[in-house]
């Protein structure tokens, strides 16, 4: 006859892991017991349970509650055992011996590999700001055993660096992403994608990317200057810029206060009926946690009855 | 025909100590392992001490453990119990027994006691 | 330590009568278990061994079942020299324990 096992059993962590060990012998051999233990090299052996034809299942008492026998119906040459709830502490060189007649006794080995999937975690970096060198945007770190596998998956043009420590029975895998910060960037999704053994599919943490700026200012309103003439209604002024985060407008005239009747609303700067004490140079003030930008202009309102026009001059300024 | 023949037993002081021999024959003594179990008068059994066949596994039961010491000379075909520090408590017929031998090389669990001495009489007393 | 508990502690029976004595585990030993007896001023012999394997030489009325936590020794026709104390024992740890005896006395 002879033993049939597995060279290597492999099972996730905690699940129940079956450790084969069938004695496929001649007809009228019979197994009087299979004895299972512990080989791990340079310790001593460690009994784990014991199948006897008479007695039935002994588990010592170092995995007492842990070892049982496969379910119904059972074969009598079969001496495979489960081992439940396996943790990482498993793992390693199991031996099954078998005591036979009268074939006397035969034994196999096997390994048990447990597979602890990784639970991947993502670090931002420090916040990104247009104009900045090569940044880190994010790391992401996963631990498992076998080591982990982790990589990046975005549209965005980047750098990846990877490092690896090694624990007593895991490795730690971390992986950084490195850009050079543009506005083109913002809200980008920057996805870490570890693949690991143990996994039924990769494991996937999206990071939204956030880079700060402020575009240059410029105000609308002034495009046809013969419209800025005493009388007209509905005159209005807007700033124009963009920013992340999103930035707030201040209005303010350059040669004295703001003239009664003018509201500002945010980015615009409404008018009442034009009146010539309504000409000046106004300003756009434009700001955001990372930065400000002014644009200023010059209202000239028209007399119709003055026949010569006047210009109208744009001045923008940061 | 399997025999076990204790001796060794008599009246000791508590504090004083005894040693039991067991001698066995009809059998391949080193093929088995053995145990020594006790009965006090008018009382039940107790396991006191086991001995495997070959390795240096020896067991003991808490109540005895530290002052009793199995041990087995396989040349001679002779068990021993040392029994030192012995209480009011330790009074009682001391047997030898085999183990029943369907278990091999395996030392969580011991067999059933298929053969037994016929008793040898413990007394501590002062 | 396992406890092992036995029932009745004693009973009076005819020759001829059927025996029950029950043993119950205080937790589960498969058939890690023995039976004997002992008659006054003797050593325990072996009656069965593996919950319900006749120890050779052991007359076949005695029979033993059970598994697990709850075991039963039955002498299906008693007879005048079955008149003595009976011992459940486990094996499954150390220290093997057991039980507190049944002694059958006539009636």
């Known amino acids: 006859g002879e033993l049939e096992t597995s060279d290597v059993v492999t099972v996730v962590l905690g699940q129940d892991a079956k450790l084969p060990c069938f004695y496929r012998g001649d007809s009228g051999e019979q197994v009087g017991q299979v004895a299972w233990a512990r080989v791990d090299a340079g310790e001593g052996a460690q009994e784990l349970a014991l199948l006897h034809s008479k007695y039935g299942l002994h588990v010592s008492p170092a995995y007492e509650g842990r070892v049982e026998q496969p379910p119904p119906p059972r074969n009598p040459l079969d001496g495979s055992v489960l081992l439940r709830n396996a943790v990482q502490a498993d793992e390693g060189e199991y031996e099954c011996r078998v005591s036979t007649f009268p074939a006397g006794s035969f034994q196999a080995r096997l390994r048990l590999r447990v597979l602890v999937p990784p639970l991947p975690s993502l670090n931002p970096g420090p916040a990104l700001e247009e104009g900045q060198g090569l940044t880190l945007a994010a790391s992401c770190t996963a631990e498992g055993s076998p080591a982990p596998s982790v990589t990046w998956d975005t549209e965005v043009k980047g750098t990846t660096s990877s490092r690896s420590f090694k624990h007593s029975r895991s490795a730690a895998v971390t992986s950084e992403f490195h850009l050079v910060p543009s506005r083109s960037m913002n809200g980008q999704p920057l996805t870490c994608v570890v693949s690991h053994p143990g996994l039924l599919q990769d494991q996937r943490i999206t990071h939204i990317l956030h880079v700060s700026f402020l575009a240059e200012a410029s105000v609308r309103g002034l495009e046809d200057q013969n419209l800025w003439h005493i009388g007209r209604e509905g005159a209005m002024l807007k700033c124009l810029s963009e920013g992340q985060p999103p930035p707030s407008y201040n209005w303010t005239r350059l040669d004295g206060p703001l003239p009664s009747g003018v509201r500002v609303d945010g980015d615009t700067l409404g008018f009442p009926p034009l009146t010539t004490e309504h000409s000046g140079i106004y300003v756009c003030h434009v700001s955001n946690e990372f930065s400000s930008r002014d644009s200023q202009v010059t209202v000239d309102v028209l007399d119709p009855q003055e026949d010569s026009g006047k210009q109208v001059d744009l001045v923008s300024a940061s | 025909e399997v025999q076990l023949v204790e001796s060794g037993g008599g009246l000791v002081q508590p504090g004083g100590s005894l040693r039991l021999s067991c001698a066995a024959s009809g059998y391949t003594f080193d093929d088995y392992d053995m145990s020594w179990v006790r009965q006090a008068p008018g009382k039940g059994l107790e396991w006191v001490s086991g001995?495997?066949?070959?390795?240096?596994?020896?067991r003991y039961a808490d109540s005895v453990k530290g002052r009793f010491t199995i041990s087995r000379d396989n040349s001679k075909n002779t068990l021993y119990l040392q029994m030192n520090s012995l209480r009011a408590e330790d009074t009682a017929v001391y047997y030898c027994?085999?183990?029943?031998?369907?278990?091999?090389?395996?030392?969580?669990?011991?067999?059933?006691?298929?053969?037994w001495g016929q008793g040898t009489l413990v007394t501590v007393s002062s | 330590d396992i406890q092992m508990t036995q029932s009745p502690s004693s009973l009076s029976a005819s020759v001829g009568d059927r025996v029950t004595i029950t043993c119950r585990a205080s937790q589960g030993i498969s058939s890690y278990l023995a039976w004997y007896q002992q008659k006054p001023g003797k050593a325990p012999k072996l009656l069965i061994y593996?919950?319900?394997s006749l120890q050779s030489g052991v007359p076949s009325r005695f029979s033993g079942s059970g598994s697990g936590t709850d075991f039963t020794l039955t002498i299906s026709s008693l007879q005048p020299e079955d008149f003595a104390t009976y011992y459940c024992q486990q094996h499954y740890t150390t220290p093997p324990t057991f039980g507190q005896g049944t002694k059958v006395e006539i009636k």
């Open positions: 027994a085999r183990e029943y031998s369907d278990v091999v090389d395996y030392v969580s669990v011991r067999t059933p006691l298929d053969y």
């Open positions: 593996a919950a319900s």
């Open positions: 001995i495997k066949a070959h390795s240096d596994n020896k």
